[in-house]
Interface confidence: low
């Protein structure tokens, strides 16, 4: 069966919507009117991995476009990365491992940890008009908490 | 292939009263839980009420309770909420959905419909 998956927008707590900066980096920033068309939709997609009642492994692709939000070493730090892929291969139900987040739902919040670095999450600064990251502290300066936008297909 | 198409909504008056309908075909209706969720413009998903295979279990959430009753008939594959007193705050896209059965807001559905506009002003 093919992976079932959902479009989406999402916005960290305060209200940054999420946007492309460049070929392969997202940045958080408030949107109003007309701008919102600017922010990335997500194709969700529900994959293989760890799952409980309020854990859900999912992939995070750019819908319509062969790019997913990966996580990877860096100088020997995790790092949040846009990712090409061959579009004829992805989504699949088993996405490699820096692929998949936890979807993680708190007080109807969302937070995104990753499955390939446990307790890094991805992260938004408070300052507008930053890169979204991926971070290694929770209830901190970064914003690791997130509302998810359903979108029609 | 999993169809689920909903009808009913509108403009409406606070106060007022509108019956939403979901036609659902592609699998069978009779064997799952079925349910509303809704988003008002520019907000999250919000989690309406569900309803049982045999129709008997229904649940609602608490900004709706006692305002909205789900029903459906398993004999056409159709899935209603009937909504009452309707408050500008109703006002958003309704969706229903086939439901999978975990308990928390986002996870709670596998396939949706399209989706009925209800606004409700003056």
């Known amino acids: 069966a093919p992976v079932r998956s959902l479009n989406c927008t999402l916005r960290d707590s305060q209200q940054k919507s999420l946007v492309m900066s460049g070929p392969y980096e997202l940045k958080a920033l408030h949107l109003q009117g007309q701008d919102m068309e600017q922010q990335v939709v997500f194709s969700m997609s529900f994959v293989q991995g760890e799952e409980s009642n309020d854990k859900i492994p999912v992939a995070l692709g750019l819908k319509e476009k062969n790019l997913y939000l990966s996580c990877v070493l860096k100088d020997d730090k995790p790092t949040l990365q846009l990712e090409s892929v061959d579009p004829k291969n992805y989504p699949k139900k088993k996405m490699e491992k820096r692929f998949v987040f936890n979807k993680i739902e708190i007080n109807n919040k969302l937070e995104f940890e990753s499955a390939q670095f446990p307790n890094w999450y991805i992260s938004t600064s408070q300052a507008e008009n930053m890169p979204v990251f991926l971070g290694g502290t929770k209830g901190g300066q970064d914003i690791t908490d997130f509302t998810m936008q359903f979108v029609s297909s | 292939e999993v169809q689920l198409l909903e009808s009913g909504g509108g403009l409406v008056q606070p106060g007022g009263s509108l019956r939403l309908s979901c036609a659902a075909s592609g699998f069978t209706f009779a064997e799952y839980t079925m349910m509303w969720v809704r988003q008002a413009p520019g907000k999250g998903l919000e989690w309406v009420s569900r309803i049982g295979q045999d129709g008997k279990n229904t649940y609602y959430a608490d900004s709706v309770k006692g305002r909205f009753t789900i029903s459906r008939d398993n004999s056409k594959n159709t899935l209603y909420l009937q909504m009452n007193s309707l408050r500008a705050e109703d006002t958003a896209v309704y969706y229903c959905?086939?439901?999978?059965?975990?308990?928390?807001?986002?996870?709670?559905?596998?396939?949706w419909g399209q989706g009925t506009l209800v606004t409700v002003s003056s």
């Open positions: 959905a086939k439901y999978t059965g975990r308990i928390f807001t986002h996870h709670l559905f596998d396939y």
